[in-house]
């Protein structure tokens, strides 16, 4: 006989969650199988896509401020994608966390780390573009790849700092039916005399803080940056949005669509401590919106590719390249890869955002396949540094 459910103090919502049972309904089991397949596929796609993006942007492209942002976004998404197989396993074994408390804490922390890092990095990208337009001379003098990396490190540190409470308050809780939850247990540390008040205040604090810091504030920064850029460009008589703008717009839209529902349900969940009537709604919806948030990491690499205009043509061309690269012996490639690496190793100062989709000389073999993923969107910038910084404002 086990009495796991009673070994530690739990919040009322957790106690009642522990009563919920796995379903025996056949149609629901089919949905479970579909969910496992979908998450498995997303895991694979996310790992491959983000791995390729990291390789292409990190090793096959001229390093610019923009590629630095994309590099760190892809790194965040790769981390999230790497944790997705474990979530898939959780689904596959009947919604039970069989991997222990430590891994439960780590797995959940990666999810939240990605959430904060994505929000912070998207804010940085928007502010960066705003500075280029509003303070072009300052941007020209201070916008370096090294500076961008330093900003990213600071943002990662902030993301880690914000993730600490989620690591601390994550726990494994045994359900009455024998399954194990990997979930918040805000009574783990100093529960205090009034359990209900502690549960309510801590859950609300967590939900509101992550909504503000990882969603509302980043979106506010993005929106105000976009407004500032639009106003400035209107004065200059610019109309058509550039390619990098389309990329950022797509990534920001995906971020808002994927994370928005999660934050809504997270806030509802916090209310459900004091309002039990919300619990069934939260229990139904939260798994779906959490998966949607995870899928943001799978969607981003696709967006990097889709926002390049010649994507379909390059896709057709690259399919031939795939076959060539598989069938051609390494010696026949004539060391194209290494010469390409030498050519792109310059750490340019304030390179244009168009550099993410710029067209260097056409690579051969496997490098071309990787090239279509992120490269070859716009003409390579030929102008001087100041002109280049100014021209980037059209993007």
């Amino acid at each position: 006989m086990s009495a796991n459910a009673t070994l530690k103090p739990l919040c009322p919502i957790l106690e009642q969650m522990s009563r919920l049972q796995s379903h025996s309904n056949t149609s629901i089991r089919y949905i479970d199988h579909a969910a496992v397949l979908l998450h498995g596929l997303a895991s694979l796609l996310g790992l491959v896509e983000n791995g390729v993006i990291l390789f292409v942007v990190g090793c096959r492209m001229r390093q610019t401020v923009v590629t630095t942002w994309v590099l760190h976004l892809a790194l965040s998404d790769l981390l999230a994608s790497a944790s997705l197989p474990f979530f898939t396993y959780f689904l596959a074994v009947g919604h039970s966390w069989e991997l222990g408390t430590t891994f439960c804490k780590l797995h959940s922390s990666i999810f939240f780390l990605n959430m904060f890092a994505s929000g912070f990095l998207l804010s940085a990208i928007s502010l960066d573009r705003c500075l280029q337009v509003v303070r072009p001379v300052w941007a020209q003098n201070h916008r370096t790849v090294a500076a961008a990396h330093k900003v990213c490190l600071v943002l990662w540190a902030l993301a880690v700092l914000n993730t600490v409470p989620y690591f601390v308050f994550r726990d494994t809780i045994s359900r009455l039916d024998g399954r194990i939850m990997c979930y918040y247990n805000v009574l783990l540390l100093n529960p205090g005399p009034d359990r209900d008040a502690t549960c309510n205040s801590r859950q609300v604090a967590l939900a509101v803080s992550k909504f503000l810091l990882a969603f509302l504030v980043p979106l506010a920064i993005i929106a105000s940056s976009h407004a500032a850029v639009s106003l400035r460009l209107q004065h200059r008589g610019r109309r058509r949005p550039g390619r990098f703008v389309r990329l950022v717009a797509a990534v920001v839209a995906a971020f808002a669509l994927c994370w928005g529902p999660y934050h809504v349900f997270s806030l509802l969940e916090a209310r459900a401590h004091a309002n039990p009537g919300l619990r069934p709604l939260v229990w139904r919806g939260l798994p779906f919106v959490t998966s949607l948030a995870f899928f943001n990491s799978v969607a981003n690499p696709v967006l990097y590719v889709l926002t390049c205009p010649d994507m379909l043509r390059k896709l057709r061309r690259s399919l031939r390249t795939v076959l060539e690269s598989v069938l051609v012996d390494d010696s026949e490639l004539g060391g194209a890869g290494s010469s390409r690496r030498r050519r792109t190793s310059s750490t340019a100062r304030s390179a244009s955002p168009l550099a993410l989709c710029s067209r260097p000389e056409e690579p051969r073999g496997p490098a071309r396949l990787l090239g279509w993923l992120l490269g070859s969107c716009a003409a390579s910038p030929q102008t001087g540094p100041l002109n280049r910084a100014l021209s980037s404002t059209s993007s």
Epitope: M1, N4, T6, P12, Q16, L20, Q21, I28, P276, R279
Partner: antibody, heavy 122, light 107 residues
């Protein structure tokens, strides 16, 4: 037809233990929870705890933690309540009741056993 | 723990009368609430769950309603077999708690 049939009345001395059984029939025993409730003579109802027969996992009212033990035998579809260190104030009728839950919601005590009178007297 | 305050503790009524019993929860329970009927020497029987849903086999003269944290059991036309003690139960949070009971007696 759902039925919960409990064991007969017991008379115990203070400090002793008592084990009350509750045999379920007419439904899938392992897919429902079994709750235990007691009622002292002329008094109201008091919740003791709940057990999931399929897993053996249980949850107790703090008041009974350490003294009450809930178990279940799936082969005979029987749930048990064992109460130790009996005191005179434990004299009561002990009831078992069935509760259900789904993946997203739960409800409480739709069917009850007939009750078992436990008398604690020296 | 959530306290369930039931009133009245007892009432006398005649057959055909409309009877109302109320229960107040000390904190939000959002309809995780039942009404039980108990006759002398018998086990309790659930009449209503989720605040207002009638159990199968329970006569339609019984009804449950909710207004904020106040829950009401109404017997529209009291029948001889309805003379019993009625308890309310909250099952929103552990430990589940019951009201003190309302004894409905023949006037």
């Amino acid at each position: 037809e759902v039925q919960l049939v409990q064991s007969g009345a017991e008379v115990k001395k203070p400090g002793a233990s008592v084990k009350v059984s509750c045999k379920a029939s007419g439904y899938a025993f392992i897919t429902y929870l079994i709750e235990w409730v007691r009622q002292a003579p002329g008094q109201g109802l008091e919740w003791i705890g709940v057990i999931h027969p399929g897993s053996g996992n249980s949850h107790y009212n703090e008041k009974f933690k350490g003294r009450a033990t809930l178990t279940a035998d799936t082969s005979t579809s029987t749930a048990y309540l064992e109460l130790s260190s009996l005191r005179s104030e434990d004299t009561a009728v002990y009831y078992c009741a069935r509760s259900g839950s789904s993946s997203f919601d739960y409800y409480a005590m739709d069917f009850w056993g007939q009750g078992t009178l436990v008398t604690v007297s020296s | 723990d959530i306290q369930m305050t039931q009133s009245p503790s007892s009432l006398s009524a005649s057959v055909g009368d409309r009877v109302t019993i109320t229960c107040r929860a000390s904190q939000e329970i959002s309809g995780y609430f039942s009404w039980l009927q108990q006759k002398p020497g018998k086990a309790p029987k659930r009449l209503i769950y989720a605040a207002s849903t009638l159990d199968s086999g329970v006569p339609s003269r019984f009804s449950g309603s909710r207004s904020g944290s106040d829950y009401t059991l109404t017997i529209s036309s009291l029948q001889p077999e309805d003379f019993a003690t009625y308890y309310c139960l909250q099952y929103a949070n552990y430990p589940y708690t019951f009201g003190q009971g309302t004894k409905v007696e023949i006037k």
